[in-house]
């Protein structure tokens, strides 16, 4: 088939697992704190179903005393992950999701990793170093993205429909050619958002609507031939 | 998959009137509409008009309105193309298109000749 | 109706180059398009679909983009077989409109 001329028209992104991360290799690591202490937080948007990788600030390990990951979720308590150095031991409190653990060994590398991201993910994420020097922190507000699917269809007489599912964030719909239109945005419980965008063509040289859908995640476009009004034999252009 | 099958050639004298067919298979006949775009040789492509099969509704650009009809068998699924007092402006290859201009029959060469 | 201006109407390119053309509405009408490309004899085929999307099977080497109300149809890597004419097609409005092409020949 076409890509993009059937009647009813269905769009899902498909993902492979891939992965993100805003750490610093260790050529960037530096003594001069100071940069690290500007960049305390950051506002990170990651697709869902790929995985992450979570830095702590860019501190030689040799000058450190813990290591905590503090996780805040939503609806949930407050998860620690720490790592003391001086006796090589772990402890974690209140954290039961199994896809956010350690990279590798804390002794090793400090950075967490979230395997396949879910909507649940969605929170604030802390790296706490203790040092000699002081307490270095960097926190990311994990902004989870979820790819919405898109349909658009002719309901009525010269009237179409298109529809970005269960999008987070919201997707917002236009139109070429602009028509007649209403949007309606539908919240759900997991923190998703459906938007409906119906228009309708009364100018009668309009032949084909495309509904253009942008998203973080990516844009797509659909488009449909408008089908003739009912009744309607014979119309000259 | 979808195919839409045309004569290669016709040729008709000048003031004569030719019927084009152009048969679909592999989808929905009745959902979709056919164009039909006529090409003069080197020169470029211009729409004829379209016929929704499910309706018989059609539209024709003001260019044509007086040299072609369009018509539907549903029972064949073929849609057909009537140009009627041919002269030598008429001469060019006739494709039928379909599914929003992704799908193109081969084209119907049309010479008119005395 | 809506014209649309394709440019260059030909071009010459050599093997490996990156070839480009453009197809504008008239008026700065809001469109969507279809590029397709047609070789002697032949019906046109659609390369690239609602401006942008690659059509299945079609060489990666080609892609379409859009700013504003212009659209661009690029080779990145010029080959032998891409030898054509290429046009672009308004499908938002009737009478739909043909671009007057763009004939590539390969220096």
């Known amino acids: 088939q076409p890509n993009n001329s059937l009647m009813l028209q269905t769009s899902k992104e498909n993902h492979a697992l891939a992965s993100s991360s805003l750490c610093m290799d260790e050529k960037q690591i530096t003594q001069n704190y100071s940069k690290v202490l500007a960049e305390v937080n950051t506002s990170w948007p990651v697709k869902m179903a790929t995985n992450a990788v979570l830095c702590c600030p860019p501190i030689a390990l040799r000058n450190l005393i813990i290591i905590t990951w503090e996780i805040i979720l939503r609806g949930q308590p407050s998860c620690t992950k720490a790592y003391k150095k001086e006796t090589n031991e772990t402890k974690e409190t209140n954290c039961t999701d199994e896809r956010i653990t350690w990279v590798s060994r804390p002794d090793q590398n400090s950075d967490l990793q979230i395997r396949t991201v879910a909507i649940t993910h969605d929170g604030y994420y802390r790296c706490i170093m203790v040092t000699p020097d002081g307490n270095f922190h960097r926190g990311y507000h994990l902004q989870v993205l979820v790819t919405p699917e898109v349909t658009l269809f002719q309901n009525r007489n010269r009237t179409a429909v298109c529809k970005a599912v269960a999008g987070k964030p919201a997707a917002h719909i236009s139109w070429i050619p602009e028509g007649d239109c209403a949007t309606k945005q539908e919240y759900w419980s997991n923190g998703t958002v459906t938007v409906k965008s119906t228009c309708h063509w009364e100018v009668h040289n309009v032949s084909t609507v495309t509904c253009h859908v942008s998203h973080l995640t990516g844009n797509k476009s659909l488009y449909i031939e408008l089908l003739p009004v009912p009744g309607a034999k014979k119309s000259a252009k | 998959q979808v195919q839409l099958q045309q004569p290669g050639s016709e040729l008709v004298r000048p003031g004569a009137s030719v019927k084009l067919s152009c048969k679909a298979s592999?989808?929905?006949?009745?959902?979709?509409?056919m164009h039909w775009v006529k090409q003069r040789p080197g020169q470029g492509l211009e729409w004829i008009g379209n016929?929704?099969?499910?309706?018989?509704?059609?539209n024709y650009d003001e260019k044509f309105k007086s040299k072609a009809i369009m018509t539907v068998d549903i029972s064949s699924s073929t849609v057909y193309m009537h140009l009627s007092s041919l002269t030598s402006e008429d001469s060019a290859v006739y494709y039928c298109?379909?599914?929003?201009?992704?799908?193109w029959g081969q084209g119907t060469l049309v010479t008119v000749s005395a | 109706d809506v014209q649309m201006i394709q440019s260059p109407s030909s071009l010459s390119a050599s093997m490996g180059d990156i070839v480009t053309m453009t197809c504008q509405a008239s008026?700065?009408?809001?469109?969507?398009l279809h590029w397709f490309q047609q070789k002697p004899g032949k019906a046109p085929k659609l390369l690239i679909s609602?401006?942008?999307n690659l059509e299945d099977g079609v060489p990666s080497r080609f892609s379409g983009s859009r700013y504003g109300t212009d659209f661009t149809l690029t080779i990145s890597s010029l080959e032998d077989e891409d030898m054509a004419t290429y046009f672009c097609?308004?499908?938002?409005?009737?009478?739909?409109?043909f671009g007057g092409g763009t004939k590539l020949d390969i220096k």
């Open positions: 298109i379909t599914y929003t201009g992704a799908y």
């Open positions: 592999g989808y929905t006949f009745t959902s979709y509409w």
């Open positions: 016929i929704f099969p499910g309706s018989d509704t059609t």
């Open positions: 008026q700065g009408t809001n469109i969507n």
């Open positions: 609602g401006g942008s």
């Open positions: 097609l308004q499908f938002t409005y009737l009478p739909w409109t």
